[in-house]
């Protein structure tokens, strides 16, 4: 079995303030079992943007139906973008663990820049 890769195809995405930003991410394999999460930033101070397993993220919608069998697309859309949303976003695959899931592999990151709202 080929080892799972986390693919974030875009190094950067530029969005006008007030619009939605689509951040793309897909896996090359269904194995190992475990959730994906999106973070802004890296390291200990990173901010959780979306957790496939649990939580309430009102501005985030998934582009594909994550519950669909064999789904490999974990792209998200973030609505009503503001300058405060600028940063680098990482799609991270976790391996199912007990008691806690363990980080398995991260995508290379997508830098989101925010343009001024067109007048």
């Amino acid at each position: 079995e080929d080892e799972l890769q986390v693919i974030q195809p875009e190094k950067s995405v530029s969005v006008a303030a007030g619009e939605s930003a689509t951040l793309r991410c897909a896996m090359t394999s269904l194995i190992p079992v475990g959730p994906i999460m999106w973070f802004r930033g890296a390291g200990a101070g990173r901010e959780l943007i979306y957790n496939q397993k649990e939580g309430h993220f009102p501005r985030v919608t998934t582009v594909s139906e994550l519950t669909k069998r064999n789904n490999l697309d974990f792209s998200i859309s973030i609505s009503n973008i503001t300058p405060a949303d600028a940063g680098t976003y990482y799609c991270v695959k976790f391996r199912k663990g007990s008691p806690d899931d363990v980080e398995f592999k991260s995508g290379a990151g997508t830098e989101l820049s925010v343009r001024a709202k067109p007048s």
Epitope: P9, T22, R24, A26, T28, V63, S64
Partner: antibody, heavy 122, light 108 residues
Framework: EVQLLESGGGLVQPGGSLRLSCAAS????????MSWVRQAPGKGLEWVST????????YYADSVKGRFTISRDNSKNTLYLQMNSLRAEDTAVYYC???????????????WGQGTTVTVSS | EIVMTQSPGTLSLSPGERATLSCRAS???????LAWYQQKPGQAPRLLIY???SRATGIPDRFSGSGSGTDFTLTISRLEPEDFAVYYC?????????FGGGTKVEIK
């Protein structure tokens, strides 16, 4: 420069066989799914078949299932399409194409060859 | 099997005009799996838009894609002489990776 070069087309009688090849260069061939797409004279594009980077997964259009076989030799950076029991309706230009990312069938095909012509006629 | 229907079949416009091409899926699909291609006579197709709305490398910003669910649109904001061609949408992700029938954008 990323390039795909098809070969192996020609004139064949109905019921005959042909093997198309696609030589790839300029990218890590084994990391990407590859596809064959055809276009009959004056018609639109028709997806034929796709193979994963490792060669472990293959996908076919119903119109060619059981007659065509897609394969790849990653050591030679070459994609193949073995076409058996050919019919007049298989007459077309056959293009090989590279998937945009390592994920099979996700975002589209970003590099295409110039095509090779297959004519099935008696 | 999901059917992709493109309309209109032919669009007759002048350079500088705006072109709006439609692609409709017979059932709801994920936008990540919708691509648009341009094909000129005697040439191979070229990827324009992936993921319904993202421009491929080197594609001018006069090309834009939008849509979700069953209805997708390719817009060319101001037609340049080199934009007159046939445009195809494609559904990826599942097998078969179905193409629409194409829209020919011709000079009026």
């Amino acid at each position: 420069e990323v390039q795909l070069l098809e070969s192996g087309g020609g004139l064949v009688q109905p019921g005959g066989s042909l093997r198309l090849s696609c030589a790839a260069s300029g990218f890590t061939f084994s990391s990407y799914a590859m596809s064959w797409v055809r276009q009959a004279p004056g018609k639109g594009l028709e997806w034929v078949s796709t193979i994963s980077g490792s060669g472990g997964s293959t996908y076919y259009a119903d119109s060619v299932k059981g007659r065509f076989t897609i394969s790849r030799d990653n050591s030679k950076n070459t994609l193949y399409l073995q076409m058996n029991s050919l019919r007049a309706e298989d007459t077309a230009v056959y293009y090989c194409a590279k998937d945009f990312t390592e994920v099979v069938g996700w975002l589209g095909m970003d590099v295409w060859g110039q095509g090779t012509t297959v004519t099935v006629s008696s | 099997e999901i059917v992709m229907t493109q309309s209109p079949g032919t669009l007759s416009l002048s350079p500088g005009e705006r072109a709006t091409l439609s692609c409709r899926a017979s059932q709801s699909v994920s936008s990540s799996y919708l691509a648009w291609y341009q094909q000129k006579p005697g040439q191979a197709p070229r990827l324009l838009i992936y993921g319904a709305s993202s421009r491929a490398t080197g594609i001018p910003d006069r090309f834009s894609g939008s849509g979700s669910g069953t209805d997708f649109t390719l817009t060319i904001s101001r037609l340049e002489p080199e934009d007159f061609a046939v445009y195809y949408c494609q559904l990826l992700g599942s097998s078969p990776r179905t193409f629409g029938g194409g829209t020919k954008v011709e000079i009026k």
